[in-house]
Interface confidence: medium
């Protein structure tokens, strides 16, 4: 499977909420011995590989924001910790996987990465990630609502797998 990023750029005004989205593509094994670990983190555009470095989102690490569920299940974070930081990640039955950030500030601008790890038999792992940019703007040039820019078909599926 691969991860697609439907939107590569989100431009939002300060104080707005935004939901960043990734989508699982391709066959997803729903066997009882297959589970998915999904999470989010901030990163930088490395020269070698985007999303290599894992930085916290609002002081929460990728471990704090994870979802872990079977292939056929939906899930969302109920962590008080995440919600206290204005964050919530969620996953539905259709392969969509998102993080919602509330009350955006300029400090939230940057590169965001979704990570999906498919775990088979509790030890074999297949890892994929997707990247998108969030720009939070203030002042007269800021949009009144979030504006999203679709990824090109090439960009949305050029996600590394390991």
């Amino acid at each position: 499977f691969k991860v697609a990023t439907p939107y590569s750029l989100y431009v939002c005004p300060e104080g707005q909420n935004v939901t960043l989205t990734c989508r699982l593509l391709g066959p997803v094994d729903k066997g009882h011995d297959v589970t998915f670990y999904k999470t989010w983190y901030r990163s930088s555009r490395g020269e070698v590989q985007t999303c290599s470095e894992r930085r916290p989102i609002r002081n929460l690490t990728f471990q704090d924001l994870h979802l872990h569920h079977g292939g056929h299940q939906a899930a969302n974070t109920s962590h008080d910790l995440a919600q206290r930081h204005g964050l919530e990640s969620a996953s539905d039955h259709h392969g969509n996987f998102s993080i919602t950030m509330r009350n955006l500030t300029l400090l939230d601008s940057g590169l965001y990465c979704c990570l999906v790890v498919e775990i088979r038999h509790h030890h074999s792992e297949h890892r994929v990630h997707g990247a998108m940019e969030l720009q939070v703007q203030t002042g007269k040039d800021a949009p009144s609502n979030c504006v999203v820019y679709p990824s090109s078909s090439q960009d949305s599926e050029n996600i590394t797998a390991a």
């Epitope: 589970t35 670990y37 290599s52 990728f62 994870h66 872990h68 509790h122 890892r127």
Partner: antibody, heavy 118, light 106 residues
């Protein structure tokens, strides 16, 4: 803060079994795998196996298959490793360590010394 | 099973020196991880995903490599860096460690 606290040192006779505990705190126990690694005196690190508290799934290095048993008690956030049919070469420090999927073992217990001697 | 071979086994050096150690895998791995261990202590994660510093690790440590050949570099040795360093792979079951490289004071 994240902590993994292991049970105390053990002295066992050859052929006996030992069960070591590892109590986790400061993080969501079911969001990680709990790994067990051992280190014989003056030697390197050797991975024994892992357990997923999320669903109880286990994996073992072939060397330990059938002799090591990994279990968890999610109600107390405690992982256990039992090693049976002990022999002198099992004398080692045994560590538990947490690992997030797609990551590394970022927190380790303090280690439990198991001495096997007649 | 993927065998990880570290070299050299031991390095004698002085504080301030630059040091490079290698980890060679018997078949290709996606990522390499590095741990530091001091006598009487549990291992400590240094590098994840080949080249990224774990939380709290000084910038004098760096990792690189791909495929079967990986490297850990310390740009300028500090007294607290004298320890044993292990590489480890999660790419293939069973998960294996290298035998370690010991850095000792000259």
């Amino acid at each position: 803060q994240v902590q993994l606290v292991q049970s105390g040192a053990e002295v066992k006779k050859p052929g006996a079994s030992v069960k070591i505990s590892c109590k986790a705190s400061g993080f969501s126990f079911t969001g990680y795998t709990m790994n067990w690694v051992r280190q014989a005196p003056g030697q390197g690190l050797e991975w024994i196996g892992l357990i997923s508290p999320y669903n109880g799934g286990t994996s073992y290095a072939q060397k330990f298959q059938g002799r090591a048993t990994l279990t968890v008690d999610t109600s107390t956030s405690t992982a256990y490793m039992e090693l049976s049919s002990l022999r002198s070469e099992d004398t080692a420090v045994y560590y538990c360590a947490r690992r997030a999927y797609g990551y590394a073992m970022d927190y380790w217990g303090q280690g439990t010394l198991v001495t096997v001697s007649s | 099973e993927i065998v990880l071979t570290q070299s050299p086994a031991t390095l004698s050096l002085s504080p301030g020196e630059r040091v490079t150690m290698s980890c060679s895998a018997s078949s290709s791995v996606s990522y390499m991880y590095w741990y530091q261990q001091k006598p009487g202590q549990a291992p400590r994660l240094l590098i994840y995903d080949t080249s990224n510093l774990a939380s709290g690790v000084p910038a004098r440590f760096s990792g690189s490599g791909s495929g079967t050949d990986y490297t850990l570099t310390i740009s300028s040795m500090e007294p607290e860096d004298f320890a044993v360093y292990y590489c480890q792979q999660w790419s293939s079951y069973p998960f294996t460690f290298g035998q370690g490289t010991k850095l000792e004071i000259k």
